[in-house]
């Protein structure tokens, strides 16, 4: 049935679905912090601009009784229950902001019109690439993915003169939802990943992947996983590593490696961090003074979502256009906006811009140091530290086949 | 297109310090590092240091170090260059511009005429 | 980091080919790809014309072409024209992440 937006005559409402199942444990509350204070942002932006305006965000709750995993398990059903909340209600806002798993968008955006635009703090897997009317405000597979081809290819920085062509990576199926896609993106055979890799081998077993730290016979020195150092820990403990192995540990949204007072741990010697580039202190920000420095990302998407729908309203008031019009719903990518932190690009597609990094440990200060940036916007890496206190010979990452001479 | 603009001249004393602005107008100031270089009078150019403006990471010329900081204002995409103790050999024109690729400025401001002069 | 050795000046007829040298050692030219090449006009803002040893940047003429054997890097114009008339600068990375420049290079076209 047709369901009436509320969006017009001065009065713009946003649609919050507030989903149990979602990419991340964040009490619902924190997130509705995270509205509240972008709503207040938004009015002030409007006001400023002359723009005389209501904006309010109606949150909707599924029930919670059937779907309670907590985790992205039942979050299709529970966010086709939601859309049918809606749809009952008859009553939608001019932009639907939610769901985060990547299993409730997929099936929520092939069952919805494409009349109003849908914002994710999450829906990481490739499955929610290219879609027309959906943006995401957390790194997709995809630039993971972009960075790591990018990344083995690289052979003309002072430390890292080999192409790579090879990779292992580790996936035992506990991982977090963000991990889960991303490594989902790496293992799938026909992702832009798998096509660039002469050889590529998935690790199921904690076994497998202690097995190759030392096998003499193994296919590639380099070894991908997704999580924190704990969780490296928990499978690697302090067993021997040979000295030619680069592990790259995925962990993007944890700003705790570039903490004053941090000291990498004797495990982290032969790893190298991916993660993101810090955002400025939201320490003193009301939203987020509950928040794990590892939670913050998903509850500022949120606040930034908002921010984002405050900006493309100011855009289309300021040009006198229809705000419940295809138009309005396609038009949330390729742009700049002001974000909580500072400036956020979205891609053609809708997906955050971000500028990754990687980190390595220093042997001399036992202190993770930035080796070198990489901007997804524009696909490319700017090495940082061209002269790194590597573990590694000659402070050079090793080639990813042993015994292979200059490539 | 990324520019960077940059104030025309400033007049100092010996003695004094000189604090050079560099705001990218047209973009932000990305995960490149901003380079400062100077030129004095008829002179080549001479390397003093960079930042990576996303991390607030620096690395000074060892000519330099101890009297120059650089440092980046993310929300306001502008990086500044302060040099102290300035004597009379200071005078120049300070360029501030982007690395696109180390040791590789492909966008340049227009520079800034510091005159240190009693 | 001491500046990088160049000829003071040289110079060429229109049509002509000159090659200006930049001369390091294996700490900075020798060591790295991350070799570049400026032109300056007079009062006016350096110019990029090649990075990593021999890449233009989109918009530079193919007139200009980088090589590098050993220590010594090479700024080649070829055709020379008037408007080629500048100071000319190398630059190369210098180990523990400094940069240096040359010592400039003028050119006249005769």
């Known amino acids: 049935s047709q369901v009436s937006q509320n969006c017009h005559n001065g009065s713009y409402e946003i649609s919050v679905l507030m989903m149990g199942n979602s990419a991340f444990a964040e009490p619902l509350k924190n997130l509705e912090d995270a509205v509240n204070e972008g709503l207040e942002i938004v009015r002030g932006r409007l006001q400023n601009a002359g723009l005389n305006v209501t904006v309010n965000a109606t949150f909707m709750y599924s029930d919670g009784l059937i779907h309670n995993s907590g985790d992205c398990r039942s979050s299709t059903c529970e966010g086709l229950d939601l859309l049918r909340k809606i749809s009952n209600a008859q009553r939608m806002g001019c932009v639907l902001i939610g769901p985060s798993c990547t299993y409730s968008t997929f099936q929520m955006y092939l069952d919805t019109e494409l009349s109003y635009p849908m914002i994710s703090a999450g829906s990481f897997g490739l499955s929610c690439d290219y879609k027309e009317t959906l943006t995401r405000l957390m790194s997709p597979a995809r630039k993971l993915m972009y960075f790591l081809v990018n990344f083995w290819k690289t052979n003309d920085l002072p430390f890292k003169t080999y192409s790579w062509s090879t990779s292992y990576v580790y996936k035992n199926g506990t991982e977090t939802e963000d991990c889960f896609w991303y490594l989902n993106a790496l293992e799938a055979s026909v992702s832009y990943f798998s096509h660039e890799l002469g050889f590529k081998v998935v690790l199921r077993q904690d076994k497998e992947f202690q097995d190759i730290l030392m096998d003499h016979n193994r296919k590639s020195n380099v070894i991908i996983m997704c999580g924190g150092p704990e969780f490296l820990y928990k499978l690697k403990g302090d067993r021997a590593v040979a000295e030619d192995i680069v592990i790259i540990l995925v962990d993007l949204f944890n700003d705790q490696y570039f903490e004053d007072n941090v000291t990498a741990p004797d495990y982290m010697k032969n790893v190298l961090v991916l993660t993101l580039s810090p955002g400025n202190s939201l320490l003193n920000s009301s939203f987020s003074r509950n928040l794990s420095p590892t939670k913050r990302d998903f509850a500022l998407a949120y606040l930034n979502g908002i921010l984002l729908f405050g900006h493309m309203l100011k855009i289309f008031l300021e040009n006198g256009e229809n705000i419940t019009t295809p138009k309005f719903a396609h038009a949330f990518r390729n742009l700049t906006f002001e974000g909580y932190d500072g400036p956020v690009t979205l891609d053609d597609w809708g997906d955050v811009d971000s500028t990754m990094v990687l980190l390595y440990t220093s042997v001399d200060t036992k202190k993770y140091k930035v080796l070198l940036t990489y901007d997804t916007h524009v696909n490319k890496t700017y090495p940082v530290d061209m002269s790194p206190t590597f573990t590694w010979k000659n402070s050079k990452l090793p080639n990813d086949i042993t015994g292979r001479g200059p490539q | 297109e990324v520019q960077l603009v940059q104030p025309g001249a400033e007049v100092k004393k010996p003695g004094s310090s000189v604090k050079v602005s560099c705001k990218a107008s047209g973009g932000t100031l990305s995960s490149y590092a901003i380079s400062w270089v100077r030129q004095a009078p008829g002179q080549g150019l001479e390397w003093m240091g960079r930042i990576i403006p996303i991390l607030g990471i620096t690395n000074y010329a060892q000519k330099f170090q101890g009297r120059v900081t650089i440092t980046a204002d993310k929300s306001t995409s502008t990086a500044y260059m302060e040099l102290s103790s300035l004597r009379s050999e200071d005078t120049a024109v300070y360029f501030c511009?982007?690395?696109?690729?180390?040791?590789?400025?492909?966008?340049w401001g227009q520079g800034t005429l510091v005159t240190v002069s009693s | 980091q001491s500046e990088l050795t160049q000829p003071a000046s040289v110079s060429g007829s229109p049509g002509q080919s000159i090659t200006i040298s930049c001369t390091g050692t294996s700490s900075d030219v020798g060591g790295y790809i991350y070799v570049s090449w400026y032109q300056q006009h007079p009062g006016k803002v350096p110019k990029l014309m090649i990075h990593d040893v021999s890449h233009r940047p989109s918009g530079v003429s193919n007139r200009f072409s980088g090589s590098r054997s050993g220590n010594t890097a090479s700024l080649t114009i070829s055709g020379l024209q008037a408007e080629d008339e500048a100071d000319y600068f190398c630059s190369s990375y210098a180990g523990s992440n400094n940069y240096v420049f040359g010592t400039g290079t003028k050119v006249t076209v005769l």
């Open positions: 511009a982007r690395d696109q690729r180390p040791a590789s400025m492909d966008v």
